[in-house]
């Protein structure tokens, strides 16, 4: 960042998207600002328009290509600049040399589905979206289940330390409504962070059979 009150944070989704947030105390809300991306060894560059997300922060997505195309590699470095219009000229507000695969945040897992449900357990699967083939199996997941009367924040986290795109939830209560979420993170990258949580999957356990001990 150019000065102490400015914060410029970006993440690469490992394929064709860099998402950036820029925050600056005292910046004018109606100022027109952009993020410019200049890779060190590619023929293309890209720009996106920063749009306000709160009183003093703006966000935008640099779309580098089709969603599943590998637009940057492990050795690319991208110069990212925040440029704001001041009258007829542009002023640089922030700059960083961005190593894409040190700053990863994958897309949220998709296609959550109940594979099998019983009275006390439920098997759920999902898929990862727009994740680079670079990772092979070196991904980890966190999952959580929302029980009746609790909040997501209270839900204990379950960690899957390998690329396992399913989970068997145990010790559930019969005939009860639950919700389930999962998120993903590569092992690679010093500043890599968890993906957003997936859309919640709602499911209901089977009722206990009458007159039977379950």
């Amino acid at each position: 960042a150019v000065n102490g009150t400015s914060r410029f944070t970006c993440f690469y989704n490992s394929r064709a998207n860099i998402s950036c947030v820029w925050s600056q105390d005292g910046a004018l809300q109606d100022t027109s600002c952009q993020v410019h991306a200049w890779p060190d060894r590619r023929r293309w560059n890209q720009t996106c328009e920063l749009l306000p997300v709160s009183q003093a922060s703006w966000a935008c997505n640099l779309i580098l290509g089709t969603p599943d195309s590998q637009k940057l590699t492990a050795v690319d470095i991208v110069t990212l600049r925040v440029m704001c219009r001041e009258g007829v000229r542009w002023r640089m507000m922030a700059i960083q040399d961005f190593k894409p695969f040190e700053n990863l945040r994958l897309m949220a897992p998709i296609s959550l589905q109940v594979v099998h449900v019983e009275t006390h357990r439920c098997n759920i699967s999902w898929k990862i979206s727009q994740a680079s083939h670079y990772f092979e199996r070196h991904l980890e997941f966190e999952a959580r289940t929302l029980s009746p009367g609790h909040t997501w924040e209270e839900a204990p986290l379950m960690t899957l330390k390998q690329k396992q795109e399913w989970i068997c939830l145990e010790t559930l209560t019969p005939d009860t409504q639950y919700e389930f979420q999962v998120r993903v993170k590569p092992l690679q990258g010093e500043f890599t962070t968890w993906s957003p949580w997936s859309q919640p999957l709602a499911f209901r356990t089977k009722p206990a059979a009458l007159g039977k001990d379950t």
Epitope: S69, Q70, T73, A74, V75, F101, E102, H133, Y134, F135, E136, H138, L187, Q188, E190
Partner: antibody, heavy 117, light 107 residues
Framework: EVQLVQSGAEVKKPGATVKISCKVS????????IHWVQQAPGKGLEWMGW????????EYAPGFQDRVTITADTSTDTAYMELSSLRSEDTAVYYC??????????WGQGTTVTVSS | EIVMTQSPATLSVSPGERATLSCRAS??????LHWYQQKPGQAPRLLII???QSISGIPARFSGSRSGTEFTLTISSLQSEDFAVYFC?????????FGQGTKLEIK
């Protein structure tokens, strides 16, 4: 089972070119990276470069980029490494390996190249 | 280019004892450090990734740790099959580079 099987030992004269093959099985070659590593007696392990079969891109280490060419034939699941203008210091074992860009998960058995006049 | 320095060059340890191998990077490499084992006449085998993450199928006696630019591979109780050469490798800056190796021999 993941396997990388390399071509046999080669003896070459200085100034010649060598081309080594690496036939893979047990994984999807089209969505993989294949790397090449040199292990010379006095120099240890040196990463030469890789080919990304999905993106169709190659990356070469500066110390090799003038003389090395890495290619792949996705119809036969085979990668190739060609090293030109051979000199005696190129006498080494050459390995192909599979991995993400950052480390090498599976290795071929190695191909010995001897450069001698 | 980042230089990886391994120490000692040779380490003599008795079976059943603990072995500690060191690898130092010439500049900060975060946790981008990986360990391999190589036996005579064989290709290297990946043991540990990102400083401390074990690869599946590798015995639990192998563990890794990091302190700044210094990385350590520990083998808690040496088995006869563990005597080999161990290499570290950085993946922070291209070209990725290996250490010169530590030969672990039977005392």
């Amino acid at each position: 089972e993941v396997q990388l099987v390399q071509s046999g030992a080669e003896v070459k004269k200085p100034g010649a070119t060598v081309k080594i093959s690496c036939k893979v099985s047990g994984f999807n070659f089209k969505y993989s990276l294949i790397h090449w590593v040199q292990q010379a007696p006095g120099k240890g392990l040196e990463w030469m470069g890789w080919i990304d079969n999905e993106a169709g891109e190659t990356e070469y280490a500066p110390g090799f980029q003038d003389r090395v060419t890495i290619t792949a034939d996705t119809s036969t699941d085979t990668a190739y490494m060609e090293l030109s203008s051979l000199r005696s210091e190129d006498t080494a074992v050459y390995y192909c390996a599979r991995g993400g860009p950052w480390f090498l998960s599976y290795w071929g058995q190695g191909t010995t190249v001897t450069v001698s006049s | 280019e980042i230089v990886m320095t391994q120490s000692p060059a040779t380490l003599s340890v008795s079976p059943g004892e603990r072995a500690t191998l060191s690898c130092r990077a010439s500049q900060i490499i975060s946790n981008n450090l990986h360990w391999y084992q190589q036996k005579p006449g064989q290709a290297p085998r990946l043991l540990i990734i990102y400083g401390l993450q074990s690869i599946s199928g590798i015995p639990a006696r192998f563990s890794g740790s990091r302190s700044g630019t210094e990385f350590t591979l520990t083998i808690s109780s040496l088995q006869s099959e563990d005597f080999a050469v161990y290499f570290c490798q950085q993946s922070n800056n291209w070209p990725y580079t290996f250490g010169q190796g530590t030969k672990l021999e039977i005392k």
